[in-house]
Interface confidence: medium
């Protein structure tokens, strides 16, 4: 017969043959043959995989740095990650929550819409067409663009949502 | 190196008053809005005040508004709290931080005990 160019699902292709993927929660120690089936070994302990694979190195388990504010959420398995969360009354920094914070910070172009309470984080906003934020805030909302019109000037450099606008003196050759 | 040394604690009577200084280095001081948090004896944190980069705006914590006042010397890379009025749940170790964002980023810290 000829030799597959495309296995089913949970298997892959190897040396002309679909040998059957490894369960999550195990490795792969040596491919299948004519005459063998896929030989598999489960994840030591701190380890993982979560997919049908052919990976030959579990995965560790993600480590919940306590010198960053991090404890356990959800100790993994063979088959899942380790969740971590913050302490109580911290934030994490992402989705990953690789880090804490007390409350975030709004970038450059972002601000405080809602300051941070004991059980809610920091919102921000971007900030709208005629409003800027050129720091890392906690709690400064976005300033609005200074009027040039009102100092009697004109806008020689237009703002942005990090910067102000620049303004500078009337064209005096104008009637 | 980020550094923040805190000091300025000591033990105070109730209605008293303390000035907690903060000298920092390692970083170019009055880029940063920077913080004063606590943590008193078997509780969390909780943040207290802050002052933004230029010194021209505070932020207070509705437990000590009105008692405390925070300030900086940026020639100096200092932050202060003035602390009024102290009360016994005042006591706490009194941590400055640098925009709050990690953990490695604190002083040690300096301990406030009100008592009589």
């Known amino acids: 017969p000829e030799p597959p160019t495309a296995c089913r699902e949970k298997q892959y292709l190897i040396n002309s043959q679909c040998c059957s993927l490894c369960q999550p929660g195990q490795k792969l120690v040596s491919d299948c043959t004519e005459f063998t089936e896929t030989e598999c070994l489960p994840c030591g302990e701190s380890e993982f995989l979560d997919t049908w694979n052919r990976e030959t190195h579990c995965h560790q388990h993600k480590y919940c740095d306590p010198n960053l504010g991090l404890r356990v959420q959800q100790k993994g398995t063979s088959e899942t990650d380790t969740i971590c969360t913050c302490e109580e009354g911290w934030h994490c920094t992402s989705e990953a929550c690789e880090s804490c914070v007390l409350h975030r910070s709004c970038s450059p172009g972002f601000g405080v819409k809602q300051i941070a309470t004991g059980v809610s984080d920091t919102i921000c906003e971007p900030c709208p067409v005629g409003f800027f934020s050129n720091v890392s805030s906690a709690f400064e909302k976005c300033h609005p663009w200074t009027s040039c019109e009102t100092k009697d000037l004109v806008v020689q450099q237009a703002g942005t949502n990090k910067t102000d606008v620049v303004c500078g003196p009337q064209d005096r050759l104008r009637a | 190196e980020v550094q923040l040394l805190e000091s300025g604690g000591g033990l105070v009577q109730p209605g008293g008053s303390l000035r907690l200084s903060c000298a920092a280095s390692g970083f170019t001081f009055e880029w940063y809005e920077m913080q004063w948090v606590r943590r008193a004896p078997g509780k969390g944190l909780e943040w207290v005040s802050a002052i933004s980069g230029d010194g021209y705006r505070t932020y207070y914590a509705d437990s000590v508004k009105g008692r405390f006042t925070i300030s900086r010397d940026n020639s100096k890379n200092t932050l202060y709290l003035q602390m009024n009025s102290l009360r016994a749940e005042d006591t706490a170790v009194y941590y400055c931080?640098?925009?709050?964002?990690?953990?490695?980023?604190w002083g040690r810290g300096t301990l406030v005990t009100v008592s009589s």
């Open positions: 931080a640098k925009e709050l964002e990690y953990f490695d980023y």
